[in-house]
């Protein structure tokens, strides 16, 4: 790391080290030999999240409901607003600038992981012994019915999309 001319939380200006403004404040004027750095708090709906020498604060992110967004965490003078998506939707990126509808898992597939505000549904194929006969964003693969426990026999084998069909056992005469 190259040497620096100033302490941490300072910056070099006119061959002198001045204090940076603390998070939540912006720079109004640099220090001089006789005066300290002048900083001012960010206004409503503005923020700065680091020690800085910015002359303007950043605007809080707007969670646009037209894009399916809502406020997850309100911004402060030191933090940006955090957006998330409405129920049934998830963010298209880490920055969460827009939302898309959660995908549903097709018949033959079950939900491995239910979608959140930031991640989509994860589907998995139903393994042997399991099935899913619906398109759903919540339903897992269900196990085939156990005919034996009902004193019945399998009349029709199950698939990944259908349950087994049970029927009565043939009685010996």
């Amino acid at each position: 790391e190259p040497p620096t001319a100033c302490r941490e939380k300072q910056y070099l200006i006119n061959s002198q080290c001045c204090s940076l403004c603390q998070p939540g404040q912006k720079l109004v004027s640099d220090c001089t030999e006789f005066t300290e750095t002048e900083c001012l708090p960010c206004g409503e709906s503005e923020f700065l999240d680091t020690w800085n020498r910015e002359t303007h604060c950043h605007q809080h992110k707007y969670c646009d409901p037209n894009l399916g967004l809502r406020v997850q965490q309100k911004g402060t003078s030191e933090t940006d607003t955090i957006c998330t998506c409405e129920e049934g939707w998830h963010c298209t990126s880490e920055a969460c600038e827009s939302c898309v509808l959660h995908r549903s898992c097709s018949p033959g597939f079950g939900v491995k992981q239910i979608a959140t505000g930031v991640s989509d549904t994860i589907c998995e194929p139903c393994p042997v012994g399991f099935f899913s006969n619906v398109s759903s964003a919540f339903e897992k693969c269900h196990p085939w019915t156990s005919c034996e426990t009902k004193d019945l026999v399998v009349q029709q084998a199950g698939t990944n999309k259908t349950d087994v069909v049970c029927g009565p056992q043939d009685r010996l005469r």
Epitope: A5, C6, E8, Q10, C18, C31, E33
Partner: antibody, heavy 126, light 108 residues
Framework: QVQLVQSGAEVKKPGASVKVSCKAS????????MHWVRQAPGQGLEWMGW????????NYAQKFQGRVTMTRDTSISTAYMELNRLRSDDTAVYYC???????????????????WGQGTLVTVSS | DIQMTQSPSSVSASVGDRVTITCRAS??????LAWYQQKIPGKAPNLLI????TLQSGVPSRFSGSGSGTDFTLTISSLQPEDFATYYC?????????FGGGTKVEIK
Amino acid sequence: QVQLVQSGAEVKKPGASVKVSCKASGYTFTGYYMHWVRQAPGQGLEWMGWINPDSGGTNYAQKFQGRVTMTRDTSISTAYMELNRLRSDDTAVYYCARDQPLGYCTNGVCSYFDYWGQGTLVTVSS
Amino acid sequence: DIQMTQSPSSVSASVGDRVTITCRASQGIYSWLAWYQQKIPGKAPNLLIYTASTLQSGVPSRFSGSGSGTDFTLTISSLQPEDFATYYCQQANIFPLTFGGGTKVEIK
């Protein structure tokens, strides 16, 4: 009362490394930068760099860049200075020195040393 | 780097004399200057003055400092036997910190 107690004298061969310790007591260790200054025999004072014990941040003089490492162990209030690839002209007394409190300084770096360690003589000789 | 040039490099004086040491910075350093006294080479220096003119706690008032920008002065108004030592200036404007070459005050 404030005290900085350094490790004992060392004799090293050229190319070797030395690690000097500086144990602080009598004040909040993490509240003040710690600097290292050396003085070769018959010479003046030479600043080597600083460590912020609170953050672990460091700043080294260009001359020592790549050869010096300053570290700290806050659990025992001790700062360390390690110098590698020693040469005969590294023979000197090495001092740790306490700076002004963090937040004291608003303009300038205002690094003035009110407390010093007793010094550690490092002799580099083949 | 900011070069600090001290003059004279040595001065012979008697007890009771007024002694003046100067320090010049290669560029303006505002008032960010300190003076140290080192009685024995290899023993730690003592901080006398900081921000060019502020006397460090416990330092006798016969020591004073002045100057701003590039030119600074350390004055000992009436030299005492314990003042025979080497004096260093140090700029504290920006890193790297730099020291003057020292001024040795010797007994005449």
